[in-house]
């Protein structure tokens, strides 16, 4: 059994040159003829030199999975899916995303350090002492209120609540 060169494929005991991206094998090589290739039909593709008898079906971006079509399929490139706004890719295979998750909402006591993108979740960070956040999409923690001279501090602020002041 011969070992074929890179970008050749084995047919019986012969090595045939592969087809170009965007094509598939229509007729394998013989003594006097090279590999005859045919263009991929619509909605199919081959991204690399190949010995495939059929092109691969183009991926479909499922809106129920939070996906939208970012780049249409071509004969030599699969469909590129992206997550809809507010979602990020959970399962990425090369440039193909199969499932999306909603961006994390920062809990009370935390602020948004890095906004979520189509391929990254939101990054949250704790509020420093003396500041608080109600969570959500807040990017800055707010400083606790300083009760005025005419007010009494009823409850000290926490990382998720402001100081509570009361009038005397």
């Amino acid at each position: 059994q011969p070992s074929c060169r890179q970008e050749e494929f084995l047919v019986g005991d012969e090595c045939c040159p592969m087809c170009n991206p965007g094509y598939h094998v229509k007729q394998v090589c013989s003594e006097h003829t090279g590999t005859v290739c045919a263009p991929c039909p619509p909605q199919t593709y081959t991204a690399h030199a190949n010995g495939l008898s059929k092109c691969l079906p183009c991926g479909v971006c499922d809106p129920d999975m939070g996906l939208l079509t970012w780049q249409e399929c071509s004969s030599w490139k699969d469909t590129v899916c992206r997550c809809i706004p507010g979602y990020f890719c959970e399962n990425q295979d090369g440039s193909h995303c199969s499932t999306c998750l909603q961006h994390t909402t920062c809990p009370p006591g935390q602020r948004v350090e890095k906004r979520g993108t189509h391929d990254q979740d939101t990054v949250c960070a704790d509020c420093l002492t003396g500041t608080f956040s109600l969570g959500g999409t807040q990017e800055e923690c707010l400083p606790w209120t300083n009760c005025s001279a005419f007010q009494q501090e009823v409850r000290r602020g926490t990382n998720s609540t402001d100081t509570t002041c009361s009038s005397q």
Partner: antibody
């Protein structure tokens, strides 16, 4: 004697059309794949299209579906219909037998695309 | 597409000398490579197919070798009528069939 004779070339304006013919003699035309190869002035050879004996057709992807190859086995003739011609299509167009290596060539017909 | 690169671009030699022309493919084309000779104002003529098989009527001073990505056309002793442009062409994976840019063999 095995022979291929092209005709139909000439001067055409950009955007125009032209149909080239290639008359074959001296061999069983229907048994062979046939091809068109072109050569721009002072440049190298460029494959244009092939039609197999089965009737399957193949084109250079760079031509963007502007050309159509066909054959009439009863007339031993190969054709190339060229539409939406551009200045860069100016070349000598050769008809050749074969779809792999081209063993018989015609003398070529000059196509000039110019306004 | 498979790109064929021929070297040198021009070869200046005297009659009787040996000419060695190279053709390199961007990826393997197996043995499916042809060589053509073209003289000014004429159609190309097939010399070699299948990398090493001579076409009927081609003198044995022309020989081809190689497989995969590296190919050579050798003219053992140049005759005056051999000065011309030579093209390699792959048909290992088609379409598209592709040609090299050519090597001109000129008289020194």
């Amino acid at each position: 004697e095995v022979q291929l004779l092209e005709s139909g070339g000439g001067l055409v304006q950009p955007g125009g059309s032209l149909r080239l013919s290639c008359a074959a003699s001296g061999f069983t035309f229907s048994n062979y794949g046939m091809s068109w190869v072109r050569q721009a002035p002072g440049k190298g050879l460029e494959w244009v299209s092939s039609i197999y004996y089965s009737g399957d057709t193949y084109y250079n992807p760079s031509l963007e579906s502007r050309f159509t190859i066909s054959r009439d086995n009863s007339k031993n003739t190969l054709y190339l219909q060229m539409n939406s011609l551009r200045a860069e299509d100016t070349a000598v167009y050769y008809c050749a037998s074969g779809s792999n290596a081209f063993d018989i060539w015609g003398q070529g017909t000059l196509v000039t695309v110019s306004s | 597409e498979i790109v064929l690169t021929q070297s040198p671009g021009t070869l200046s030699l005297s009659p009787g000398e040996r000419a060695t022309l190279s053709c390199r493919a961007s990826r393997s084309v197996g043995k499916y490579l042809a060589w053509y000779q073209q003289k000014p104002g004429q159609a190309p003529r097939l010399l070699i197919y299948g990398a090493s098989s001579r076409t009927t009527g081609i003198p044995d001073r022309f020989s081809g070798s190689g497989s995969g990505t590296d190919f050579t056309l050798t003219i053992s002793r140049l005759e005056p009528e051999d000065f011309a442009v030579y093209y390699c062409q792959q048909y290992g994976s088609s379409p598209p069939v592709t040609f090299g840019q050519g090597t001109k063999v000129e008289i020194k």
